[in-house]
């Protein structure tokens, strides 16, 4: 049904789902503190550029009751129960911020009369993509995907000059909810890494990936996976691992790895790590500053959907230009804007734009370093360290299948 | 060790002025968006002002606007309040916190206007 939006007369709401069910288990607190941060910042930047006008938010609960997984697998009818609740206390902002599951946030964009924009932390998976009046604000599966398929045909880097097509995808179950749409996305025989691969198969037993490590007949040297260190620990533990196994772990949202006195333990010598650049300084090869704030990312996402708001709140009332309308439920794409730790660009499909880093493990320093940084903007890979201490032979990442190339 | 320490409060009559210090350690200073907090007797925590990391942006409530003025050096690892036309109602424990959620805070400095 058509609700009423809280969005005229120089008062500007924003509805704000506050989900039991979440991609992160960030307490509830934590993201009430990052949307108040960021009412007080679009504010003073609206009250600077002359525009006085009033912006709240309202924090939208859900009652907990039946949806109490905690997780995302129960979240596809919390997020429409909210909805709902919206509905019947006719409170319907003129953005809606929330819900980070992938699950609901495709629900609730299938079930309802979109006139509105939708500002999610998380959607990671494939189905939300190309979604016309939805943003997501953490780098959703397309991006890592596209990443991979370009890291895949390199061949031209003094490190690697191989093209790959080949790959193990492990994925046992028990992933994050962002590691789950990333995997998914890999597994999925009708997408973009599928199809640019000869072989790709998935490794669903601990004892199938272990195996692989020093099986002889292998179809592929390249395991990809998502976690943590300790995650892969637990599973490779001290198993000897042959010398032309490279293993990729995507760890998106994790900035240890840049962290003073942080040594890489011997179990990460065969892995590249990938992470998300931490923000607003330049990479260098090596650390020995620290980069890096604490790990934040799921609150930061809902902190710059408010400061997204402010930017596109601002634009429009400069212009003269209605709020309630489909021109700015679209409009929340293809821009850049100031976001807490500095510029955030969106693409054309309203998604967030981000430098991707690909670490190794340095034999000399026993340090992660970085190897090059991936531009998901401009589809480009930047080579950064053109003489890696890898612990491949040759300093040279070993060709995708065994028997060619460096062994 | 991670800390914020802040300095410069005192006694002050009505009309003067006082600059707060907050120095910064162990962490990296030029990387968060600082906030200066204020405390009156009996009451509840209040903003003054709000500064991004390289300075680029400041903010402050209206009750402060045109009388306080925040500033930082990320050199110095320092972020300073600077305060005007100070009024009896200005009376409080002022305290400097880093990042949104403000997740680490001084030990506070206080500062008392009154003849």
């Known amino acids: 049904s058509q609700v009423s939006q809280n969005c005229h007369n120089g008062s500007y709401e924003i509805s704000v789902l506050m989900m039991g069910n979440s991609a992160f288990a960030e307490p509830l607190k934590n993201l009430e503190d990052a949307v108040n941060e960021g009412l007080e910042i679009v504010r003073g930047r609206l009250q600077n550029a002359g525009l006085n006008v009033t912006v709240n938010a309202t924090f939208m609960y859900s009652d907990g009751l039946i949806h109490n997984s905690g997780d995302c697998r129960s979240s596809t009818c919390e997020g429409l129960d909210l909805l709902r609740k919206i509905s019947n206390a006719q409170r319907m902002g003129c953005v809606l911020i929330g819900p980070s599951c992938t699950y609901s946030t495709f629900q609730m964009y299938l079930d309802t009369e979109l006139s509105y924009p939708m500002i999610s932390a998380g959607s990671f998976g494939l189905s939300c993509d190309y979604k016309e009046t939805l943003t997501r604000l953490m780098s959703p599966a397309r991006k890592l995907m596209y990443f991979l398929v370009n890291f895949w045909k390199t061949n031209d880097l003094p490190f690697k000059t191989y093209s790959w097509s080949t790959s193990y995808v492990y994925k046992n179950g028990t992933e994050t909810e962002d590691c789950f749409w990333y995997l998914n996305a890999l597994e999925a025989s009708v997408s973009y890494f599928s199809h640019e691969l000869g072989f790709k198969v998935v490794l669903r037993q601990d004892k199938e990936f272990q195996d692989i490590l020093m099986d002889h007949n292998r179809k592929s040297n390249v395991i990809i996976m998502c976690g943590g260190p300790e995650f892969l620990y637990k599973l490779k533990g001290d198993r000897a691992v042959a010398e032309d196994i490279v293993i990729i772990l995507v760890d998106l949202f994790n900035d240890q790895y840049f962290e003073d006195n942080v040594t890489a333990p011997d179990y990460m010598k065969n892995v590249l790590v990938l992470t998300l650049s931490p923000g607003n300084s330049l990479l260098n090869s090596s650390f020995s500053r620290n980069l890096s704030p604490t790990k934040r990312d799921f609150a930061l996402a809902y902190l710059n959907g408010i400061l997204l708001f402010g930017h596109m709140l601002k634009i429009f009332l400069e212009n003269g230009e209605n709020i309630t309308t489909p021109k700015f439920a679209h409009a929340f794409r293809n821009l850049t804007f100031e976001g807490y730790d500095g510029p955030v660009t969106l693409d054309d499909w309203g998604d967030v734009d981000s430098t991707m880093v690909l670490l190794y493990t340095s034999v000399d320093t026993k340090k992660y370093k970085v190897l090059l940084t991936y531009d998901t903007h401009v589809n480009k890979t930047y080579p950064v360290d053109m003489s890696p201490t890898f612990t491949w032979k040759n300093s040279k990442l070993p060709n995708d299948i065994t028997g060619r190339g460096p062994q | 060790e991670v800390q914020l320490v802040e300095s410069g409060g005192g006694l002050v009559q009505p009309g003067g002025s006082l600059r707060l210090t907050c120095a910064a350690s162990?962490?990296?200073?030029?990387?968060?968006?600082m906030t200066w907090v204020r405390q009156a007797p009996g009451k509840g925590l209040e903003w003054v002002a709000k500064?991004?990391?390289?300075?680029?942006?400041?903010y402050y409530p209206d009750s402060v606007k045109g009388r306080f003025t925040v500033s930082r050096d990320n050199a110095k690892n320092s972020l300073y309040l600077q305060m005007d036309n100070l009024r009896a109602e200005d009376t409080a424990m002022y305290y400097c916190?880093?990042?949104?959620?403000?997740?680490?805070w001084g030990q506070g400095t206080l500062v008392t206007v009154s003849s």
């Open positions: 500064i991004r990391h390289d300075g680029g942006e400041k």
């Open positions: 916190t880093r990042d949104y959620n403000k997740d680490l």
């Open positions: 162990g962490f990296t200073f030029s990387r968060y968006w």
